[in-house]
Amino acid sequence: MEDEKPKVNPKLYMCVCEGLSCGNEDHCEGQQCFSSLSINDGFHVYQKGCFQVYEQGKMTCKTPPSPGQAVECCQGDWCNRNITAQLPTKGKSFPGTQNFHLE
């Protein structure tokens, strides 16, 4: 792959924030935005937020979706607004699971 050596400083993006880590805020600022879905005690837990540290996002976003967790990442202001992470189940739902948005 061609090594272009970008000289620009990392840009900060505004991201939608939903979940316990957001406190009372509905947005956050970071180098990447994310939307995640995980299964916790039988619930589908949806979260959105930002990675302040680019490398943290880079590593987290590398992780392939599993039956218990999926993360989708993007760069751009509010880019995670219309992203909903999906588990790799090809349309099948897990027995005994419910949708649950962490607000």
Partner: antibody, heavy 119, light 107 residues
Framework: EVQLQQSGAELVRPGASVRLSCTAS????????MHWVKQRPEQGLEWIGW????????RYAPNFQDKATITAVTSSNTAYLQLSSLTSEDSAIYYC????????????WGQGTSVTVSS | DIQMTQSPASQSASLGESVTFTCLAS??????LAWYQQKPGKSPQLLIY???SLADGVPSRFSGSGSGTKFSFKISSLQAEDFASYYC?????????FGGGTKLEIK
């Protein structure tokens, strides 16, 4: 067991280039960011940059932007550091290191490669 | 670039004593700080990550504290193998930068 095996010491002429290697075992480099760090004799540590071997993305410290090129070959599980237009200031030990999502820091380090620039 | 100012540059101490090093960041870095130990002729070894968390296998006499711009690293009850150089590193914003190091010598 995770290991990073670096290539042997290099003695190079001023103005020349050198390529150092870092071969990983015990993990797939595609699952990590591979970093390089410089340490001059009796001095501190300087971060050079990283590569994501999965997609080839790189980040460099400004001081090394025109000096260093980091590459990786996933089939051989190896990361490389190429240093160009060498001067005595480039004489140092160069370490590769693995950045993991367990600690979000450089958890494992190679043993280092000594580069001596001399005519 | 974020500057990391580490102090002291060197310190002498005796076996069994406690020592504390400080690292100051030129801007806030949250808890994105690591501490490494390096012995002569060896590569650095991770001791502390996320400013306060102990890496696996690291003895509990090592500890880290702080957030934002001021961080501390403590070794309680010094052992012979602890005499080495120690470096802090910020991992918040590239270029990641190290402190200048602290060389801990036996008194």
């Amino acid at each position: 067991e995770v290991q990073l095996q670096q290539s042997g010491a290099e003695l190079v002429r001023p103005g020349a280039s050198v390529r150092l290697s870092c071969t990983a075992s015990g993990f797939n480099i595609k699952d990590s960011l591979m970093h390089w760090v410089k340490q001059r004799p009796e001095q501190g540590l300087e971060w050079i940059g990283w590569i994501d071997p999965e997609d080839g993305e790189t980040r460099y410290a400004p001081n090394f932007q025109d000096k260093a090129t980091i590459t990786a070959v996933t089939s051989s599980n190896t990361a490389y550091l190429q240093l160009s237009s060498l001067t005595s200031e480039d004489s140092a030990i160069y370490y590769c290191a693995r950045y993991t999502s367990r600690y979000y820091t450089m958890e494992y380090w190679g043993q280092g490669t000594s580069v001596t620039v001399s005519s | 670039d974020i500057q990391m100012t580490q102090s002291p540059a060197s310190q002498s101490a005796s076996l069994g004593e406690s020592v504390t090093f400080t690292c100051l960041a030129s801007q806030t870095i949250g808890t994105w700080l690591a501490w490494y130990q390096q012995k002569p002729g060896k590569s650095p070894q991770l001791l502390i990550y996320a400013a306060t968390s102990l890496a696996d296998g690291v003895p509990s006499r090592f500890s880290g504290s702080g957030s934002g711009t001021k961080f501390s690293f403590k070794i309680s009850s010094l052992q012979a193998e602890d005499f080495a150089s120690y470096y802090c590193q910020q991992l918040y914003w590239t270029p990641w930068t190290f402190g200048g190091g602290t060389k801990l010598e036996i008194k």
